[in-house]
């Protein structure tokens, strides 16, 4: 289900990544240099920026982030 409108609920931040609020709704997600071999799970639909640099992701399937706008 959709997350309720709230100012006190945290947007989804993938495990080990660092997250930073970006305005009222959005989230900047830094998953760099984590040795990831695939995209992190539970990415928020409110993600405005995603850093996957310095990882081991060799290929991406078509439309790898369908939940992101």
């Amino acid at each position: 289900g959709s997350s309720p409108r709230s100012g006190v609920l945290l947007r989804g931040c993938p495990t080990h990544c660092h997250c930073e609020p970006d305005g009222r709704m959005l989230l900047r997600v830094d998953c760099s240099d984590l040795g990831l071999s695939e995209l992190p799970s539970n990415l928020s639909v409110f993600t405005s920026y995603l850093d996957l640099s310095m990882n081991n992701i060799s290929q991406l399937l078509p439309n790898p982030l369908p939940s992101l706008r």
């Epitope: 409108r5 100012g7 006190v8 609920l9 945290l10 947007r11 931040c13 709704m25």
Partner: antibody, heavy 117, light 107 residues
Framework: QVQLVQSGAEVKKPGASVKVSCKAS????????MQWVRQAPGQGLEWIGE????????NYNQKFQGRVTLTVDTSTSTAYMELSSLRSEDTAVYYC??????????WGQGTTVTVSS | DIVMTQSPATLSLSPGERATLSCRAS??????LNWYQQKPGQAVRLLIS???RLHSGVPARFSGSGSGTDYTLTISSLEPEDFAVYFC?????????FGGGTKLEIK
């Protein structure tokens, strides 16, 4: 700098109502939610509810539903929390605090509400 | 409601020592955790949001970690001003709930 200045201490009788104010300054009032949290003597923190000053949208803790009303006056950048049907267990320090994207970054100094017959 | 349990209730340490404070949630909160500091007569202070993000102005000796239901606040080397009460708070679902607090006192 961001400041949240709350109204003074209140002493109320059981069954009465109390209205606590929280005047915000140092930021754009309508850009942040306002949270209300209380702390009973020697206890932890308990969330009461929140209001979005941009349109007065509210969420309440079900524990307080029907007894608490959160309002704002955007012309004075002031938030209000009214709690009715007071009982002794409502004796606590009540805090307002602003939030954005899930964390509460500035808190008021607290308002002590004492409920005693 | 999600129940947050902090341990220990009281932690007695000396300046310069390392402090480890624990917070356990009754269900998975997906890293949606904040830590706050409370001192007598002062406003509550945000230390860490999103489990590990240091709020501006918070010294680097504070760090947050954990996942799932178990989270930790670590103070690498205690300074005299760190002795206070610390609360964790989950931001995973309404209502947000706080732990009972850990009082960090001087040994």
């Amino acid at each position: 700098q961001v400041q949240l200045v709350q109204s003074g201490a209140e002493v109320k009788k059981p069954g009465a109502s109390v209205k606590v104010s929280c005047k915000a300054s140092g930021y754009t009032f309508t850009n942040y939610w306002m949270q209300w949290v209380r702390q009973a003597p020697g206890q932890g923190l308990e969330w009461i509810g929140e209001i979005d000053p941009s349109d007065s949208y509210t969420n309440y803790n079900q524990k307080f539903q029907g007894r608490v009303t959160l309002t704002v006056d955007t012309s004075t950048s002031t938030a209000y929390m009214e709690l009715s049907s007071l009982r002794s267990e409502d004796t606590a320090v009540y805090y307002c605090a602003r939030s954005l994207s899930g964390y509460v970054d500035y808190w008021g100094q607290g308002t002590t509400v004492t409920v005693s017959s | 409601d999600i129940v947050m349990t902090q341990s220990p209730a009281t932690l007695s340490l000396s300046p310069g020592e390392r402090a480890t404070l624990s917070c356990r949630a009754s269900q998975d909160i997906s890293n949606r955790l904040n830590w706050y500091q409370q001192k007598p007569g002062q406003a509550v202070r945000l230390l860490i949001s999103y489990r590990s993000r240091l709020h501006s102005g918070v010294p680097a000796r504070f760090s947050g970690s954990g996942s799932g239901t178990d989270y930790t606040l670590t103070i690498s080397s205690l300074e005299p001003e760190d002795f206070a009460v610390y609360f964790c708070q989950q931001g995973n679902s309404l209502p947000p709930t706080f732990g009972g607090g850990t009082k960090l006192e001087i040994k």
